[in-house]
């Protein structure tokens, strides 16, 4: 038997993926465990094998279909179970009634690109990935810019309180290398959280023109 504190957390990406992490103090690393999804109003069940990500936590993705297919709605409830093999039997280690649109975490924004760069400003655009059409425009973004000599944690957060897939960064230093990241969050959902940060986009501001009056 496995004793200890257990935590089972899952998020829906709003389309066709439920990502789950199960943490269990004192669990055996080589035990075979599965997440089993049982929707209340769908004809499919889905499993994924939990793989170790640290000493006491495991993760897997329930892939429900093609990446952009809308597999669940706001009225769905999915019973999620962690089952681990004990000899010839499978034991339920954790269970939750999962409301997908109350537990959202979107994919990180993609396709970041510099639209226009000057000496002191830079216009950047991006796209959201695998986000449900149900949200319409009900999304918000956070962005951050990495300046030379600083860390990402020190970067101030810029908040965009609407579905705006671009930003104009101002008051930048000429001829300087920067990096930029953005993340997205739906307004819907009691336990909804921010997406992962996008891959960083590196850019350089233009040098100040020499010999010109300012």
């Amino acid at each position: 038997a496995v004793n200890g504190t257990s935590q089972f957390t899952c998020f829906y990406n709003s389309r066709a993926n439920i990502s789950c992490v199960w943490s269990q103090d004192g669990a055996l690393q080589d035990t075979s465990c599965q997440v089993h999804a049982w929707p209340d109003r769908r004809r499919w069940n889905q499993t994924c094998e939990l793989l170790p990500v640290s000493q006491a936590s495991w993760a897997c993705n329930l892939i429900l279909g093609a990446p952009d297919s809308q597999k669940l709605t706001t009225v769905d409830i999915v019973t999620l179970r962690v089952l681990c093999r004990e000899g010839v039997r499978w034991r339920v280690m954790a269970i939750q009634d999962f409301k997908p649109f109350e537990n959202l975490r979107l994919m990180a924004p993609i396709s970041l690109q510099v639209v226009h760069v000057e000496t002191h400003r830079c216009n950047i655009s991006w796209e959201i990935s695998q986000a449900s059409h149900y949200f319409e425009r009900h999304l918000e973004f956070e962005a951050r810019t990495l300046s030379p000599g600083h860390t990402w944690e020190e970067a101030p957060l810029l908040t965009l309180k609407q579905k705006q897939e671009w930003i104009c960064l101002e008051t930048l230093t000429p001829d300087t290398q920067y990096e930029f990241q953005v993340r997205v969050k739906p307004l819907q959902g009691e336990f909804t959280t921010w997406s992962p940060w996008s891959q960083p986009l590196a850019f350089r501001t233009k040098p100040a023109a020499l010999g010109k009056d300012t």
């Epitope: 599965q34 069940n45 094998e49 892939i63």
Partner: nanobody
Framework: EVQLVESGGGLVQAGGSLRLSCVVS????????MAWFRQAPGKEREFVAV????????EYVDSVKGRFTVSRDNAKNTVYLQMNNLKPEDTAVYYC????????????????WGQGTQVTVSS
């Protein structure tokens, strides 16, 4: 709709080897737990081996343990059955099966199936 196509069957002498392949199309391959079954003439379809979606865990019927190895290549949408030290009693049509639910795949009923590939082991 998911489609499965097996290949690699044939006639082999006892003690020989064969490698079966099953290519999956029509859906996201990594959704599926994959299994091999076999059906000898006049007998029911029998579970042989299963591999989880990640490929980390495999299970076998007792009669093939140590001789057969099931594996998958998620980049190639393919599951394999490497059969070594074949015996005449391994003669059967071998079927590839797919199910999104690991816990249902052995029950046969809700699986997607390939057309099968004949394996004949002569003594």
């Amino acid at each position: 709709e998911v489609q499965l196509v097996e290949s690699g069957g044939g006639l082999v002498q006892a003690g020989g080897s064969l490698r079966l392949s099953c290519v999956v199309s029509g859906d996201v391959f990594v959704r599926y737990t994959m299994a091999w079954f076999r059906q000898a003439p006049g007998k029911e379809r029998e579970f042989v081996a299963v591999v989880t979606d990640s490929g980390r865990t495999t299970e076998y019927v007792d009669s093939v343990k140590g001789r057969f190895t099931v594996s998958r290549d998620n980049a190639k949408n393919t599951v394999y059955l490497q059969m070594n030290n074949l015996k005449p009693e391994d003669t059967a049509v071998y079927y590839c099966a797919a199910n999104t639910d690991y816990f249902q795949i052995r029950s046969v009923d809700n699986n997607a199936w390939g057309q099968g590939t004949q394996v004949t082991v002569s003594s």
